[in-house]
């Protein structure tokens, strides 16, 4: 087979309808889309293309100038009307930068084998495109079984004299593709076999899917693959200030179209998004998550002088419990509650009262009774103690009444009502309470308890006593029960005013039991434990006083 | 109550350098932006630079980019303008003032100012 | 930078009556629905003292007879019946954008 190596063939006078044709071919040359990125565009190549013709007589290039006397680049062949055409155009080598895949684009013309006369036998109306791949730049010297065939072109339009007449150029578009490559790079080769071509410009080109930022994520340029039907998925990068909880993706189509997102990127705290980009969240304005859309301004009485805040600081005297969201306004603890009344029923009270007039901005306001003992004369209070019981509870009331049981009866009391929120445990200030005043009713006396023997003869024994731990009122008298023992049912009852008593007419050397209660306006309390004495046998002289176990 | 006292004025020649302080009590200073604001004699009120509470933002006005610069000492509860390259027009009464809190900020409290004359 | 510029640069008053002072921002000062617009008052000798802030709002402390109001880039403060006090130099700073730009002032004397 012969070689394809050599023999540039110099340019010539171009044939006229060559210079129609190119006439027309430039208004139709447009800028390549943004996902083509050419590896050779013959119409941009000022100098020399460095192509070879084999033989030098078969293609030619035409020296036009384009209205900016740019050079253009065209080859043509016509040779109908001889037999057994073998000519080749070989492109100089053309690196492929990493594609696997790339598209050839040719225009060209194609005359009408109709429209000549007396070439009908060896006119050919198509032409064939070859490649070779080669890591060379200067691999051109081979053979041509070595080329691997691209494709036969054909025109879809052919011109005929009529058309030349005319002046109308049919310029034909034909792409093709090639792939998958393996090398560096590549040579194209052009075989005309017998027809009337000119070959205006070839644009060989790889498809990309363009850098884009979507989502907040930045996706590189990317190759598309061998494939046609391939999709590459690729990984995209937040932009600044961003973050994702899903990795973003995309996947490139052999098109160069972007297809298929996965994930996101979002503005972190303290960010937010405008125009594609993160921005900083202005002083007076935070955000407090990357889940949230935009920066918002600081709640009510809170404040931020940053720059890309999370969170807002509270004004002073207001708080945030650490449960309470960065979006919910500072709020204080509550005034006191009002107009607080008590209503005494012996040795209980219930206290009633209106809500605070400033809850501090919390719908979560409960009270807290304190209760205190106070003396009377001496005006010291002390804690209640464990004893008093509240009705429903002591702290956490939600309700603007409570009742206090089993107090002291005739005692007086300060019951301090507090109103307390979810920031009262934060505030430093005073407690905000109102106080409540009572004196519990007078009750019945607890029992005497301390009885001491006095003067003890044949027929009297003297008693005496102190007066009860919880006299509770003012006591009146005390109530002295006494019989000789196992004789219950006959006993006899003294009164007294006195915290002693002589019983008389008693029989010597017997045992009586004694029991005493007191009375209080309120009524009788319960009886004493009993106590026993002996009276002294006839004979015997009087007892000394001494205390009763 | 609120206080900014400014000190570390004084006379300074072209060129020289001198550095202001403002001492602030009676409030949160380490949550507060401060400003320096300036004013010439006989002249209006001059925004010079400010500072957020974290020292996270600030900010310069371009008469003293490059020369001036604002800091603060949050556990002193301290302010500072160190001032380079001094010119005689910037020569003025130097104000530290607080950023407020009510939205949108203006500049609620402000302290007695310190003079800051540049002569040769 | 965003130049301020109040009119008048000075005026005088009767006692009781009305005080205008005008203030002009060269691009909107507004910024999410509020006007970044402040207002202070001067005495000799004395530090400034904040009067409103965010174009309308009258700082704790200062009589109601202050006033404010404006958005975008006309502003205007108000003293709707002068008292001797009141005569003093007048600002009026955005605080939009920095560098947070005064105007010039305004002398506001009584007659």
């Known amino acids: 087979p012969a070689s394809l190596a050599g023999c540039y063939s110099a340019p010539r006078r171009a044939p006229l309808w060559t210079c129609l044709l190119l006439c027309a071919a430039l208004r139709t040359l447009l800028a390549s889309p943004s996902n083509e990125v050419n590896l050779l565009d013959s119409r941009t190549v000022m100098g020399d293309l460095g192509w070879i013709a084999f033989p030098k007589n078969g293609w030619e290039e035409i020296g036009e100038v384009d209205e900016n006397y740019a050079p253009i680049h065209t080859y043509q062949v016509c040779k109908v009307m001889e037999q057994n055409q073998n000519n080749w155009l070989l492109t100089s080598w053309i690196s492929n930068e990493g594609a696997s895949r790339i598209f050839i684009e040719l225009k060209f013309t194609l005359r009408d084998c109709n429209s000549l006369p007396g070439g009908l036998g060896t006119c050919k109306e198509t032409f064939n495109m070859y490649y070779f791949e080669s890591d060379d730049q200067n691999g051109r010297n081979i053979k041509e079984n070595q080329y691997i065939k691209i494709d036969t072109i054909a025109a879809d339009e052919s011109f005929t004299e009529l058309d030349l007449g005319d002046r109308v150029m049919k310029l034909n578009t034909e792409v093709r593709d090639v792939g998958p490559l393996s090398k560096k790079g590549f040579y194209l080769a052009f075989q005309d076999v017998g027809a009337c071509i000119a070959l205006v410009s070839v644009r060989v080109y790889y498809k990309k899917c363009p850098s884009v930022v979507r989502h907040l994520a930045v996706f590189p340029d990317t190759i598309t693959g061998a494939d046609s039907s391939q999709l590459l998925e690729v990984s995209g990068s937040c932009v600044n200030h961003s973050v994702t909880d899903e990795p973003p993706k995309m996947h490139c189509s052999a098109e160069g179209e972007w297809l298929v997102p996965i994930g996101k990127c979002m503005c972190k705290a303290g960010y937010e998004e405008k125009n594609g980009t993160c921005q900083v969240c202005r002083p007076g304005f935070f955000k407090a998550s990357p889940h949230i859309q935009s920066c918002g301004k600081c709640p009510p009485h809170s404040y931020t002088h940053e720059e890309a805040s999370t969170s807002c600081v509270c004004e002073k005297d207001y708080f945030r419990r650490e449960s309470d969201p960065p979006t919910m306004a500072c709020t204080r603890p509550p005034s006191a509650p009002r107009n607080a009344i008590s209503n005494v029923n012996e040795t209980s009270v219930f206290l009633e009262w209106i809500p605070p007039a400033d809850t501090g901005g919390r719908k979560d306001v409960s009270y807290y009774i304190a209760c205190k003992k106070c003396n009377s004369h001496a005006g010291v209070c002390e804690e209640c103690g464990g004893h008093v019981r509240y009705l429903p509870r002591q702290s956490g009331l939600k309700n603007t009444s409570v009742m206090m049981v089993d107090l002291l009866a005739h005692t007086n009391y300060t019951f301090e009502i507090e109103a307390v929120n979810g920031v009262s445990d934060l505030s430093p200030g005073a407690r905000q309470y109102v106080s409540v005043n009572v004196t519990t009713n007078q009750a019945a006396p607890s029992p005497v308890t301390n009885v001491k023997k006095g003067k003890i003869a044949k027929n009297s024994i003297s008693l005496s006593w102190q007066e009860p731990d919880r006299p509770n009122g003012i006591i009146l008298e005390y109530e002295i029960k006494y019989f000789e023992k196992d004789q219950e049912t006959s006993y006899t009852i003294i009164k007294s005013k006195e915290t002693t008593i002589t019983a008389e007419g008693l029989k010597p050397a017997s045992v009586y039991v004694f029991q005493i209660r007191a009375r209080t306006a309120a009524g009788y309390g319960v009886f004493s434990r009993r106590f026993e004495f002996e009276t002294t046998p006839v004979f015997a002289a009087s007892s000394d006083q001494s205390q009763i176990p | 109550e609120v206080q900014l006292v400014e000190s570390g004025g004084g006379l300074v020649q072209p060129g020289g350098s001198l550095k202001l302080s403002c001492a602030a009590s009676?409030?949160?200073?380490?949550?507060?932006?401060i400003h320096w604001v300036r004013q010439a004699p006989g002249k209006g009120l001059e925004w010079v630079a400010y500072i957020s509470g974290a020292s996270t933002t600030i900010y310069y006005a371009d008469t003293v980019k490059g020369r001036f610069t604002i800091s603060r000492d949050n556990s002193k509860n301290t302010l500072y303008l160190q001032m380079n390259s001094l010119r005689a027009e910037d020569t003025a009464v130097y104000y530290c003032?607080?950023?407020?809190?009510?939205?949108?900020?203006?500049?609620?409290?402000w302290g007695q100012g310190t003079l800051v004359t540049v002569s040769s | 930078d965003i130049v301020m510029t109040q009119s008048p640069d000075s005026l005088a008053v009767s006692l009781g009556e009305r005080a205008t002072i005008n203030c002009k921002a060269s691009q909107s000062v507004d910024y999410d629905g509020d006007s970044y617009m402040n207002w202070y008052q001067q005495k000799p000798g004395k530090a400034p003292k904040l009067l409103i802030y965010?174009?309308?709002n009258l700082e704790s402390g200062i009589p109601d007879r202050f006033s404010g109001s404006g958005s975008g880039t006309d502003f205007t403060l108000t003293i709707s019946r002068l008292e001797p006090e009141d005569a003093a130099s007048y600002y009026c700073?955005?605080?939009?954008?920095?560098?947070?730009?005064f105007g010039q002032g305004t002398k506001l004397e009584i007659k």
């Open positions: 700073q955005q605080s939009n954008e920095d560098p947070f730009t």
């Open positions: 003032a607080r950023y407020g809190t009510s939205f949108p900020y203006g500049l609620d409290y």
């Open positions: 009676g409030f949160t200073f380490s949550t507060f932006g």
């Open positions: 965010g174009a309308s």
